[in-house]
């Protein structure tokens, strides 16, 4: 029975050429976390590896950053950019607990943060 | 060959205080949850602390008899886990046991073979 | 705190019997975080059983573990010379961990 819960940072907008933090959170369970993915709909973006540390994928590498934390920095964006984010939590011995967040990259000035919400 | 070596164990006074130290060899440490945990003589084990990966923050959890009072504490570098033991008791009297647990792909669980902390006057 | 009642707190078989040992939780444990130890005098405890049925490494297959929610069982088919020792069930489903008090398998 798998009892955590992924919190996000949800819903986020973020003008062209900005950075943005990907934030996740996994709560409510004792399982230990082995590795966290980042993926970009069905590219892997990036991993935080319990034995193994960071890596970036290599067509990444120029606009990624690792962190803060198991989080992901995502730099110099472009409209692109918009789109599903999920943070993959692999975890012993629950499995994996997935968030998901959606990220708007806007040509105007005007970007407001979206509420954090929960994805049990 | 997988090893844990605990020490730091021995005789003190109660209220004073002690280090644990437990070295690990043959696996890999870094990926590795540590605890310790303890048996008083004649008596069955005890949880007394883990401290988690650097994935998992490092977090740090403590059973309820020496919390505020044991801290655990980990050098990834040194492929060692530490336990501080202040403000020891009498009723700390035990053998305590470094754990090691690791999943990758398998599950393994470690344990070293134990250091004696004695608190006595 | 989840409290773990082991039953029988000793057990006085012969070898070639069957053995039954019991652990009881006050609240539900998740079966991933249930762990079983044999413990020999003298020495520390060694994994046994993980995530209430899987055997760890080494273990004969005349050990097995079964249970769900707060009852959960280790089982020996028939047992031998080297199995008598002290077992001990663990969760760590919730903080803080626990273990039950154990229950002595001896040779009758």
């Known amino acids: 029975m798998m009892t955590g819960t992924i919190e996000t940072t949800g819903n986020i907008s973020a003008e062209k050429g900005g950075s943005i933090i990907l934030q996740c959170h996994l709560s409510s369970t004792t399982a230990q976390v082995t590795q966290v993915n980042w993926e970009q709909q069905d590219q892997l973006l990036a991993i935080c590896n319990a034995d193994l540390g960071w890596h970036i994928s290599p067509s990444f590498k120029d606009r990624v950053a690792p962190g803060p934390g198991l989080g992901l920095t995502l730099q110099s964006l472009t409209v692109n950019d918009t789109g599903e984010y999920f943070c993959i939590y692999h975890t012993y011995p629950d499995g994996t607990y997935t968030g998901r967040i959606f990220l708007e990259v806007l040509e105007s000035s005007v970007a407001e943060h979206g509420a954090r919400f929960q994805i049990p | 060959e997988v090893q844990l070596v605990e020490s730091g164990g021995g005789l003190v006074q109660p209220g004073g205080s002690l280090k644990l130290s437990c070295a690990a060899s043959?696996?890999?440490?870094?990926?590795?949850?540590m605890d310790w945990v303890r048996q008083a003589p004649g008596k069955g084990l005890e949880w007394v602390a883990e401290?988690?990966?650097?994935?998992?923050?490092?977090?740090?959890n403590y059973g309820e008899s020496v919390k505020g009072r044991f801290t655990i504490s980990r050098d990834d570098s040194k492929n060692t886990v530490y336990l501080q033991m202040n403000s020891l008791r009498a009723e700390d009297t035990a053998v305590y046991y470094c754990?090691?647990?690791?999943?990758?792909?398998?599950?393994?669980?470690?344990w070293g073979q134990g250091t004696l902390v004695t608190v006595s006057s | 705190e989840i409290v773990l009642t082991q039953s029988p707190a000793t057990l006085s078989l012969s070898p070639g019997e069957r053995a039954t040992l019991s652990c009881s939780a006050s609240?539900?444990?998740?079966?991933?975080?249930l762990y079983w130890y044999q413990q020999k005098p003298g020495q520390a405890p060694k994994l046994w059983i993980y995530?209430?049925?899987t055997l760890a490494s080494g273990v004969p297959a005349r050990f097995s573990g079964s249970g769900s929610g707060t009852d959960y069982t280790l089982t020996i088919s028939s047992l031998e010379p080297e199995d008598f020792a002290v077992y001990y069930c663990?969760?760590?489903?919730?903080?803080?961990?626990?273990f039950g008090q154990g229950t002595k398998l001896e040779i009758k």
């Open positions: 663990h969760q760590w489903s919730s903080f803080p961990y626990t």
């Open positions: 609240s539900s444990v998740s079966s991933g975080y």
């Open positions: 995530g209430t049925s």
């Open positions: 043959g696996f890999t440490f870094s990926g590795a949850w």
């Open positions: 401290i988690r990966t650097k994935v998992n923050n490092h977090a740090t």
């Open positions: 754990r090691g647990a690791l999943y990758d792909g398998f599950y393994f669980d470690y």
